[in-house]
Each structure stands twice: as C-alpha cells, then as structure tokens.
C-alpha cells in the first residue's frame, strides 16, 4: 500500500485531515500528548480502520477498548474503507490516560477521498483503475513485470503535413489518439472538496521535452483534446469537479530512448491543500504512473516479409522485373522509388532500416533514416513515413558521416540464446574498424548510442572496415531454416570458393570461364584464378577478416559450426587494401521468406550450369529455400553493391512482446 501523509493530533483543538483511499496514513499521537499521560486508546467511525503496532498491548479495559503505552515504539496507522460523502464525516477519537488525571480527548475529523492515476500497467491493452499502489512507481521487465508503455508518436497521420505527429501539439483525430497511451485520473470526493484542494499534474523538468500529455475534454459535438504537459509545460493545474469523476489523458512520447534518456517517464498527480489562503499550498498526496518509451526494434530475415522497396534507375528494368517476380512469389507488396525521386541513388538498403515500435494497444512500423543523405535522402520522410508508419533518424544531418553509417552496415540476427542469456528479439549487428586510427571508419557514435539505448537487441560490433564499402551485408546474411535454431548464418567464404574451383580443375574444367556472357569484362579461366598468387594472398587476408567475425558471431550469438553455411565467394583488394567482391557477392541476397534473390555470380559454366549457382543451391535448397539468381552485374555489382544493397524489406513484427524480456 502506498505511503500517505503523517497526521499529528492534539488535544487543544480538533484536527482536520484528508485520507486517500489505498494509502496508509501515520498518526502521531505522542508528540502533543499531555505531559502526565502515559497511555492512550482509540475510537473510530466505522469507515476508518486503525492499526496499532506495539507488543504486547498494555492493558485490556473492561469496556473492550485497549490502551497502549505512550512511547516512541508505538506506531499508529489508519486507512479508510470508502470515500466520504461530506467533508470530515469520519472521526477518530484519541483518549489520553494518566494515573492521576481524567482522560484527555483529541479529535481527528477525516475526509476520505479517492484519487488515482491509472494507465495500462498490466500491459493488457486496457486501463484498469488502480488505487494508489507502490507498483505503479516502478517499471519492471519480464512476463510478470508491470509498468505502462508509451509510443513515440512518430508517424504522420495527416497526409497534408510534412511533420511527425509528435512535432505539433494538436490531436489530429481519433486515429492520432490511437498512437497515444490512455491515462485516467479517477476522483471521488465530497462535492465541496476542490474549493479547498487542488490537483496538479506534472512531469520532471528533465523529462518534459520527452512527453506530451493531452487532456480529453468532452464537448457536446466531439471529443476535443488540449495539451496540458509537454516541452514548454512541466505542470498543469486541473479543474476537477467534486463527486465521482474520471478524467482521461492521452500521452505521447516525443523521444526514443537514447544516451541521456533511459526511456522512463513519470507522470505525477499531486493533491495540494489550498485551504489557508495566507499560506503556501501544501502537498497532501501524490500518485504517479511510470511509463517506458517503447524501443525501436529491428526485424531479422527470418520474419515474414510484407513489403519490398527498390529503386528504378537507368537501365535496371531487368533487375526490377526479377525483384518484382520474387516479391510476387513471396506475396509481398512492392514499392518502387522512381528515378525522379531517387536522384540516381539506387542503394535502398543503405538509406533506411525498417523496424517497429509496440505497445499493448498498438504496433507501428518505423523507418530509421540513415544520415548518409545521398539521392534517396527524401524517400524515408516523404514516401515511407505516413499514417501509421513512423520515422526516426540519428547522426549528423550534414557531413561527418562515413560509409559505415549506411544501413547495409546494420543487420539483426534472429532470436538466439547464448548460454543462459536469451535474446528473444535477436541482436543488432553492425560493422566497425578493428581499432581506431587516423583513417579508420566506424559507425557514428550517435547511431551506436541510439541502437544500444533501445536495450532489447543488445548490439554486437563486427569488423567490416576491411571492405571498400565496409558493410556487414557484404559478408553475412541469415536465412530461415526448419531445424536447429530456426535459421542459418551465411558467411562469404574464399576458402569454399577455392575448394570448389580446385575440384572443378581436378575434374578437367580448368579452362571453364568466369564472367562468360559479360560484355567488356575480362573473362577468367578457373586455372588462371587458381594460379594467381596475388589474388590468393588477398583472399587469404579476407578469409582472416571473415574468420575473425565468424568467431565473434559464434561467441556473441551462441552459434555452432553447424549453424553456419559457407557461401563460395572471392574478393580482391583494391586501393588502400580495401576488399570488394571479385564476382557478384552471393551472400548479399534478398531474403523473402523461403524465396531468395541471389546475385547471379556468372561463375564457370560446367555441364551447362554455373558451378557457383549449383553449389549454393545444394547448400540452401535442403532447407526448403528457393534460389533465384538475379543479374545485377552492370547496374549494381560494378557500382560496388548487389541485390541486398539495392533493396529493402518491411517485415512482420515479432509475436514476442519486448516487455516480456529481461535485457
């Protein structure tokens, strides 16, 4: 039970006090007791329950009421059973007893009131009225945890607007309200109670810029809302009528968890005694609700796809046809960003990452806009954000970004268990340098901080700065699987490729050509590739880099070797010893459920079939996956990217609720 106030009683005059239902009020009977009295007894109205803690009771009176010694060890607490119909309608009488004097009486007139701030602390999607209880003041994780949840109102329900809903202090309509969390203030008081008392709703100054609270005012025609708390307003006096009354508030978060904001927001209602005009208002009671702002959550390749995004650029019609066909097979919506909107920037994966936010009453997809800001920079904000589709961005919006701030360098694993630690929403993966140096690249700290602050997908830092482009999607991917952990990790593997080529040469196919059918491209014989010592040295270096990540992933995701599939791939080292794919990078694939869009490698044709394609199919088809090889050579590969880099996917949110995990 929540702590109420301390009431001091005195024999000199009657004491008037307010007792809030559901709170434990302490009664100080000692400090004003007559000097020659040594004990006291208590009589109460039926609506008051008094509890006296002292063992043993001093003496049982014949009338049936007990007396207790007046000493510091005695604790008198009281609670009320119901709200009062009129002011002071409940009474407590303290009788002080002494050896030589008649009993001295002290009177306490109590007014019982019900004042409670309620929200969906049980996370059921419904607000249940709660009396003042301690639990509302703490937010706990896990299936037995409790505490309310707020969504950042980061969508744009008004198509005419260019701003997110949380950027204005208006409620557009009932649709906008659904993005907010309901909070109800329930009061039950005597009719004249608020002539002498006031309620104030408030939020800490440190949190006022993270939240906005609207009060629903029921008009005759429609339900209107007005801002009562927000970035410019940390407190608001409430006009509450006497009697029984419910007041609804709608709460929206304005900021995601981040470095200096753990995501917790406490809203408090304070009851003030304003009866003495010549004195300052005194706090009589407070009730609080703690909300946690829902984190932004990424979805791995194992989640069902819902929508595919791709750019239309000069001469990529065939690529578009292939992606369209794949999306149809996977029963996905397809969104094509036209040339006039992408400004010749085809790297859809790099511009944005689509995740979601969730509260018990609402789930919202949210696009995380990278700070790379090239030709596609307007696409997330103008075309993706909209009604019930939120938006967030981090990092410098002008300059100061590196290639590692693009979101081809941001992936998430499927759910994993590492030892005793469960990651039911997977773990975020991003690439970094091995160590900081004058020219090393790393993901911008603002992005790293944001990802870590979400708490539910603890990030793992991989090593990707060895690549020309520097993105983790150049050497890893995840595909769904029917067995084991429900997925496989795919890693690009020069070792596997050399092994395959060596086998083909041993079988007499050393003259088979890589890049057959590619115009203006030097075709390479298997035997020449195998005998090129420089290329071998380069791939030996690449293998070491990938192996470093392999061990890191095994450790951080709790994987065994049998959870990993090696995809044959060669790389070449270019300027400044940075690596890029020697032939189209097959691991950089589009995963749409069981349908995979894999860059066509243009490997050596043996017995009428590309040996690289054949090898990959033999590795993935037993998992029930369907491989489609997409020609991206001229439009993507030679521009340092592949199918995954050129596409993006919105996926179905996890069925697992983030608040049920323990980070």
């Amino acid at each position: 039970m929540a702590q109420g106030t301390l009431i001091r009683v005195t024999p000199e005059q009657p004491t008037h006090a307010v007792c809030v239902l559901g709170t434990l009020t302490q009664l100080d009977v000692c400090s004003s007791a007559p000097e020659d009295c040594t004990s006291f007894s208590v009589n109460t109205s039926p609506g008051v329950v008094v509890d006296i803690a002292h063992s043993p009771p001093a003496k049982k009176k014949s009338t049936g009421s007990s007396t207790w010694p007046l000493d510091p060890g005695v604790e008198v607490t009281l609670t009320m059973k119901a709200a009062s119909g009129s002011t002071g309608d409940q009474k407590v009488q303290i009788s002080y007893h002494g050896p030589k004097t008649p009993p001295v009486k002290a009177l306490l007139y109590l007014t019982g009131v019900e004042i409670s701030l309620s929200a969906d602390i049980t996370r059921t999607g419904k607000v249940k009225p709660t009396r003042a209880v301690e639990d509302k003041r703490t937010w706990t994780w896990g299936p037995c945890g409790q505490g309310a949840i707020l969504l950042v109102n980061c969508d744009r329900d008004n198509p005419e607007s260019s701003a997110m809903d949380c950027e204005d202090d208006e409620v557009l309509d009932s649709k906008d309200l659904k993005d907010m969390s309901l909070m109800t203030l329930s009061t039950k008081t005597p009719q004249d109670f608020f002539t002498r008392h006031t309620l104030v709703l408030h939020v800490a100054r440190s949190e006022m810029d993270k939240v906005r609270v609207f009060q629903a005012t029921r008009g005759r025609l429609s339900s209107r809302c007005r801002v009562v708390l927000g970035p410019k307003q940390p407190s608001h006096y409430l006009m509450v009528p006497g009697g029984k009354h419910n007041m609804d508030f709608y709460v929206e978060a304005l900021a995601f968890p981040d470095t200096n904001f753990p995501g917790l927001i406490t809203l408090t209602v304070s009851m003030l005694d304003t009866s003495k005009l010549e004195l300052p208002e005194a706090v009589v009671f407070q009730d609080s609700v703690v909300f946690r702002v829902a984190p932004w959550i990424m979805t791995p390749n194992t989640q069902p796809p819902q929508e595919v995004y791709v750019c239309s650029i000069f001469e990529n019609e065939d690529f578009l046809k292939s992606v369209t066909a794949l999306a149809m097979q996977a029963r996905c919506k397809l969104t094509i960003c036209p040339e006039e909107e992408n400004m010749d920037d085809q790297w859809m994966q790099d511009e944005m990452e689509i995740g979601y936010i969730q509260a018990p009453h609402k789930t919202l997809p949210v696009v995380f806009d990278s700070p790379r800001n090239r030709g596609l920079k307007e696409f997330p904000i103008k075309r993706v954000m909209g009604p019930d589709f939120g938006y967030v961005t981090r990092g410098p919006q002008t300059g100061g970004v590196s290639g590692l701030d693009s979101f081809g360098n941001l992936e998430v694993s499927p759910p994993v268990t590492v030892g005793d630690k469960e990651y039911p929403l997977g773990r975020i993966l991003f690439g970094d340098s091995c160590y900081p140096s004058s020219d090393s690249r790393e993901m911008h700290q603002a992005l790293q901080d944001f990802l870590s602050a979400q708490q539910v997908q603890a990030p793992v830092k991989l090593y990707s700065d060895w690549l020309t482009v520097g993105h983790v999607d150049e050497f890893l991917s995840f595909v769904p699987a029917p067995d084991r952990k429900g997925f496989r990790l795919l890693l690009a593997s020069p070792r596997s490729c050399y092994k395959l080529f060596q086998e083909q040469q041993n079988e007499g196919h050393g003259d088979a050509l890589l890049f057959q059918g590619i115009k203006k491209k030097n075709q390479q014989k298997i035997k020449n590739i195998l005998s090129n010592t420089t290329l071998r040295e380069h791939n030996s270096f690449v293998e070491r880099c990938i192996d470093w990540n392999r061990e890191l992933l095994k450790r951080e995701l709790g994987l065994a070797e049998s959870d990993i599939i090696d995809i044959p791939q060669l790389f070449k080292l270019k300027e400044f010893s940075k690596a890029e794919a020697f032939f189209p990078n097959m691991v950089n694939m589009l995963v749409l459920g069981k349908h995979l869009g894999i860059p066509k490698p243009f490997g050596p044709i043996i017995n009428g079939r590309c040996c690289l394609e054949e090898k990959v199919c033999s590795l993935l088809e037993p998992l029930g996956l369907h491989c489609t090889f997409i020609n991206d050579f001229y439009t993507y590969h030679i521009r340092h990217g592949e199918v995954h880099c050129g596409t993006n996917v919105r996926r179905k949110p996890f069925s697992f609720k983030w608040w049920n995990m323990v980070p």
Partner: antibody, heavy 128, light 111 residues
C-alpha cells in the same frame, strides 16, 4: 577521358573557411578516384586528400586532417574540398586529380595512388 | 622537408640520358610498387608520365622509363629533348598516416 575544372579559390583570412569544387565533364565522375593535391608558391607538390569511387572512404594528409573534408556528389559530377580553420601555410594552388576505378582489375592496380588526369588548379591565399 | 628525397636538380644535353632518383623508406617506396612520376612545366598542371614503378600511360614517349631497387625508385629519360626541361616529382603510396607522399621535386635542365 574526363576533364576537371577547379573553382572556389580566393583570398581568405586565417581561421576562415573555403569550399573548393572540382567539376567533371566528358565522363561520369562516379567511376573515378579523386584526389586533391596542392602546391605552395615556388614549392613542390603535396598530396592533401582522397575519396574513392564508391564514395565509401576518405583519406587525409596529417597536415589537414580534422580541418579539411572531402566529399562528392555523383549526381552533380562534382567533388568538394571543405577547408576550415585555414592557416597561412595552406596558401597554395589546389589541384583536383583523378584516376579511373577499373572494375576489370583483378588485383590492386594502384589507381588510387596516382593521378592521371589533372585540373588547372585554383589559388587559395590565406592572409590577414 | 619532403617525405621522399629527390636531387634538387639534374641536367643533360639533348640526346643524352638522365636519371632522377627518389629515395624513400621500407614503409613506402620499399614496400609498394605504387611509385609514380609527374612532369610539370612552369605555370602548368602536373602530368602523369610513369605509374606503378614502370608503366607508362598512353601518349607518353618510351624515352621515359621507371625502375625501383630497394627503397629507391628512379626515372630515366633517354634521348633528352628541349621540351623535357621541367620539374619532375616522384610519388609513392605509404604505410604512414599520410598515405600518399611526394618528393620535393627535381628541376631538369636541358643544356
């Protein structure tokens, strides 16, 4: 063959800023590595900065790191050199130079380390 | 002071050969085959004449040749002609935090 034209030079006070542009014609700059090299009056060449064709990494000389930023806008076929906190010793003719990033190369061709096309240069004078 | 060391000046008569040296360290010239040479006439932009130690861009006469031994690279101009009079700069990729280094330049005078 690509042609390069530098612009944006001029007189600036110490501590000031300038942005140099290197505009390309005759070819798509996105296929090229681009470097800035400078030459102080009567002195030798000094390599300043580099950006790769894929626009994914940059390098700087110790003398300018933290003050200069190289960037490219492939849609505008232009590379920029943003120069902040300029000092008297930054006074020089600034040349933009490029080398084609040939995807056919099997192994490191070193194209990022040499400059086969040069602009005419733009003079930057830092003086109070 | 430049990172790569070149002689201040060399000279030769028309028809003769001259060699310009460029000395670096094990971390640049000695480590990489990414040495290039540039010719610069007064008031003009430099022009690439040798790259990757000994390769010549198209249009550069075969009188210009490059080589490397240990930490020293060399440019040899045979059959000197009057128009060869210019400043010559060597350059190399480097392991240092400045990844491309130039020599101080050599003034070639054709007598």
């Amino acid at each position: 063959q690509v042609q390069l034209v530098e612009s944006g030079g001029g007189l600036v006070k110490p501590g000031g800023s300038l942005r140099l542009s290197c505009a390309a014609s005759g070819s798509t700059l996105s296929d090229y590595f681009v470097s800035w090299i400078r030459q102080a009056p009567g002195k030798g060449l000094e390599w300043v900065s580099f950006i790769n064709a894929a626009n994914t990494f940059t390098y700087y000389a110790d003398s300018v790191r933290g003050r200069f930023t190289i960037s490219r806008d492939n849609a505008k076929n232009t590379v920029y050199l943003q120069m902040n906190s300029l000092r008297a010793e930054d006074t020089a003719v600034y040349y933009c130079s490029s080398a084609n990033d040939d995807v056919d190369d099997i192994v490191a061709p070193g194209r990022g380390y040499y400059m086969d096309v040069w602009g005419r240069g733009t003079l930057v004078t830092v003086s109070s | 002071q430049s990172a790569l060391t070149q002689p201040r000046s060399v000279s030769g008569s028309p028809g003769q050969s001259v060699t310009i040296s460029c000395t670096g360290t094990r971390g640049d010239v000695g480590r990489y085959n990414h040495v290039s040479w540039y010719q610069q006439h007064p008031g003009k932009a430099p022009k690439l004449i040798i790259y990757n130690v000994y390769e010549r861009p198209s249009g550069v006469p075969d009188r210009f040749s490059g080589s490397k031994s240990g930490n020293t690279a060399s440019l040899t101009i045979s059959g000197l002609q009057a128009e060869d009079e210019a400043d010559y700069y060597c350059s190399s990729h480097s392991r240092s935090s400045t990844p491309v280094l130039f020599g101080g330049g050599t003034k070639l005078t054709v007598l």
